[in-house]
């Protein structure tokens, strides 16, 4: 039950995180004009990964896409790549984790397969979260560097009559959304990995004992008794008839009402 809860919660947290990463990637406010000593501005600039926008005092907002690919800074391209990789990995992770959920039964999928899928999706979520955090952090670092450079420029060469005041940019809302979303995806991934440990079958090293009867040759392989004793309902007990010509599951694990959280 705790395993199902951990897995389910990991999935939900990752889902929210990936939705946040997608939202952050699409948002226009990665960097916003620094209003330092003037809280109200006639022209407010803000920029995203895909376009830059200007909001005028009337409320009119105009956005222009970055229609060049080669002319963009390498750092911006790197951030774009990291965010897209994060989204793709997260989306694949979500797809895998849906089939890995313990509360969803698909045919006669073994729990060991579900465990592997849970681990795979967990790792994907972790990498996805790290990509998002890395992307946002790279962009934030770029902003900090540019901020201090433009601040230095503002206070140099002011001897002349005409001043060219550079627009300084500071952290936009998308950065905080990205950091939080990346963190959630990472946490979700860790939870999936933890859930995987609980799902994985624990093999016991009992020696198989053969009982020879006069008429039939039936081999009993102990290990399935864990199911009845409650030590691990995931292990299958195989009875081998006629030299293993046909197998059937003796113990089926049905979800109990407590598994639905």
């Amino acid at each position: 039950m705790a395993v199902t809860a951990c897995q389910g919660l990991g999935f939900v947290v990752s889902l929210i995180g990936i939705a946040g990463i997608i939202a952050a990637t699409c948002m226009d406010q990665w960097s916003t004009q620094d209003l330092y000593n003037n809280p109200v501005t006639a022209v407010f600039n803000y920029q995203g990964l895909w376009r830059s926008c200007v909001r005028e005092s009337s409320g009119f907002t105009e956005c222009r896409g970055y229609f060049t690919l080669l002319g963009l800074p390498a750092m911006l391209q790197a951030v774009r790549a990291l965010m897209i990789v994060g989204i793709v990995l997260g989306a694949i992770g979500l797809l895998v984790s849906i089939f890995a959920l313990k509360c969803i039964r698909i045919g006669s999928m073994e729990d060991s397969a579900k465990a592997n899928m849970t681990l795979t999706s967990g790792i994907m979520f972790i990498v996805s979260g790290l990509c998002a955090i890395a992307g946002v952090s790279v962009f934030a670092n770029m902003l900090v560097t540019n901020f201090w450079m433009s601040t230095a420029n503002m206070y140099t060469g002011m001897g002349g009559m005409v001043q060219t005041v550079q627009t300084r940019y500071t952290f936009g809302a998308a950065l905080f959304v990205g950091w939080v979303a990346g963190g959630l995806t990472l946490i979700g991934g860790v939870m999936m990995c933890i859930a995987c440990r609980g799902l994985a079958p624990e093999e016991t090293n009992y020696k198989a004992v053969s009982y020879h009867a006069s008429g039939h040759s039936v081999a009993y392989k102990p290990g399935g008794f864990k199911a009845s004793t409650g030590f691990g309902s995931n292990t299958k007990n195989k009875k081998i008839y006629d030299g293993g010509a046909r197998t059937e599951d003796e113990v089926q694990s049905y979800p109990s009402k407590h598994d639905y959280v």
């Epitope: 004009q33 003037n38 109200v40 501005t41 006639a42 022209v43 600039n45 803000y46 920029q47 830059s52 926008c53 200007v54 005028e56 005092s57 009337s58 409320g59 009119f60 105009e62 222009r64 005409v162 001043q163 060219t164 005041v165 627009t167």
Partner: antibody
Framework: QVQLVQSGAEVKKPGASVKVSCKAS????????MLWVRQAPGQGLEWMGN????????YYALKFQGRVTMTVDRSTSTVYMELSSLRSEDTAVYYC?????????????WGQGTLVTVSS | DIVMTQSPYSLAVSLGERATINCKSS????????????LAWYQQKPGQPPKLLIY???TRESGVPDRFTGSGSGTDFTLTISSLQAEDVAVYYC?????????FGQGTKVEIK
Amino acid sequence: QVQLVQSGAEVKKPGASVKVSCKASGYTFTDYLMLWVRQAPGQGLEWMGNINPYYGRTYYALKFQGRVTMTVDRSTSTVYMELSSLRSEDTAVYYCARDGYSLRNAMDYWGQGTLVTVSS
Amino acid sequence: DIVMTQSPYSLAVSLGERATINCKSSQSLFNSGNQKNYLAWYQQKPGQPPKLLIYGASTRESGVPDRFTGSGSGTDFTLTISSLQAEDVAVYYCQNAHSYPYTFGQGTKVEIK
């Protein structure tokens, strides 16, 4: 058509207050910022501040802060500008003007002006 | 505050001749975000409120005759009346529309020679 109609001329004594109104018609009143600009006799134009009729948010020029109050009455599509502690140098024609949407912060329509004379 | 300086103070031009008014700002009115200049030109005739002629330094307001042309970028701007008409006699103002507080030039009076 867009019209901004202002209240009539006022004569005030120094230290008094004046309240000028500006009634808008011909457009969606809450969609456009309203600005106040004054012009002393024979002088140039001076921006005093603006008001967002939708939120009622105001922004005043530093020179007038503490003395000017801009308010809005959405039910009558009217904005008001009140200037207190009047001095002789406040004698001017006061204009309300609309900030034209998508016009790079330019003022596309103006009221006819209200002459405020401050004299003892 | 951005200081707007217009020149000349007054201008006398013959009918049909070209009139040129200059406006210089103490700070750039160019916005890199959208590559636009935030400068407006107004015409004010005696006893009337100002009338918008040009916004964004070069875009003519609807209904304004095409003899009025705005040009310039950054800190230096020009309003040109290609062929002066009798009804163009007025005072012309440039306005900083980039930063609060909005500021105006002192005005240029255009008369007929």
